[in-house]
């Protein structure tokens, strides 16, 4: 899996979308988990409704919501009031029994809100930033990591 980067601004909402084959994953519940470090296990944050037919209902865990369009094949996760410590590696998962298939690997990047710091003399100065086009709308900027940006083995 490539890793897709979703950029959000601190204090705002970030929406992450994970497309999937609706036929292949028919009848399966979905989950959103946070990976511990680059290679660590993925800890469940929130999962869709226990009844698959009700997967369209939004479920919350704290400030994180999940909803599944099972016909269209799109899992959507919303991180409300994004905070610095929300940054990290995540996965969208399709559940079957005790197993989980990875639908998408996601890097959530938390950027500074320039409006919070407009009076500060010694701090955040956004350079060219595609994510600051509109500081008040829910949005996400996504990009896939380039081929040259694959993990490389630790040096000995």
């Amino acid at each position: 899996h490539n890793t897709t980067v979703f950029q959000g601004v601190a204090g705002q909402s970030l929406q992450v979308s994970c497309p999937y084959d609706s036929m292949k994953h028919w009848g399966r519940r979905k989950a959103w988990c946070r990976q511990l470090g680059e290679k660590g296990p993925c800890q469940r944050v929130v999962s869709t409704h226990n009844l698959w037919l009700l997967s369209f209902l939004r479920r919350w865990n704290g400030s994180t919501a999940i909803t599944d369009d099972t016909l269209g094949g799109t899992l959507t996760i919303t991180l409300r009031n994004l905070q610095p410590h929300d940054a990290g590696l995540y996965q969208c998962q399709s559940l079957h029994g005790s197993e989980a298939d990875t639908l998408r690997k996601v890097l959530v990047e938390v950027l500074a809100d320039p409006l919070d710091h407009r009076d500060a003399g010694d701090l955040w100065f956004p350079g060219e930033s595609e994510s600051f086009e509109d500081a008040h709308v829910e949005h996400s900027i996504s990009r896939s990591l380039l081929e040259g940006e694959i993990p490389f083995p630790p040096t000995s």
Partner: antibody
Framework: EVQLVESGGGLVQPGRSLKLSCAAS????????MAWVRQAPTKGLEWVAS????????YYRDSVKGRFTISRDNAKNTLYLQMDSLRSEDTATYYC?????????????WGQGTLVTVSS | NIQLTQSPSLLSASVGDRVTLSCKGS??????LAWYQQKLGEAPKLLIY???SLQTGIPSRFSGSGSGTDYTLTISSLHSEDLATYYC????????FGGGTKLELK
Amino acid sequence: EVQLVESGGGLVQPGRSLKLSCAASGFTFSYYGMAWVRQAPTKGLEWVASISTGGGNTYYRDSVKGRFTISRDNAKNTLYLQMDSLRSEDTATYYCARGDIGTTYWFTYWGQGTLVTVSS
Amino acid sequence: NIQLTQSPSLLSASVGDRVTLSCKGSQNINNYLAWYQQKLGEAPKLLIYKTNSLQTGIPSRFSGSGSGTDYTLTISSLHSEDLATYYCYQYNNGWTFGGGTKLELK
């Protein structure tokens, strides 16, 4: 093992330029926000500039804004700091610092630093 | 912008002592505070982030606490290798380091 190795420091005259590099290894460079932090001789730490994972978002402290440019090359796993119009008060050890995954808010690993001396 | 004041600037203590270092912000930091240790001639090392989260590999004798504008780093039992300068650092509004507290042997 995470490694950050700075290079490019040295003695430079006021008004001249210098470009620092930081070679990263032991982790997936493109996952992490990066920054430069400096420390003048016998003084405390001072944040200089930060850059997002893809390089599209850059942040600078007021005193270097318009003179310094932070950039990165994810294909080469390298962070840069282009320093122009250098002043004597820019004299310091410059540390390359790695943020956490997806952020530059705090710094989890630091290089050993490279000394920049601005003097005539 | 947020200023951080560390006290004392110099602290003398003995091995085995319980040591408390203070950091005060000029405005609310919302728990977005970290502590760094820097030994002479070395790069800083992250000890604690988000007020009280211990960085991986850091001994449990280090702990952090506080809220609002006032924060504390505690070393429960001082070891000789803990002698260093300690910096607090806030990331609630930009990036600001405190002036440091130098911890020396009494």
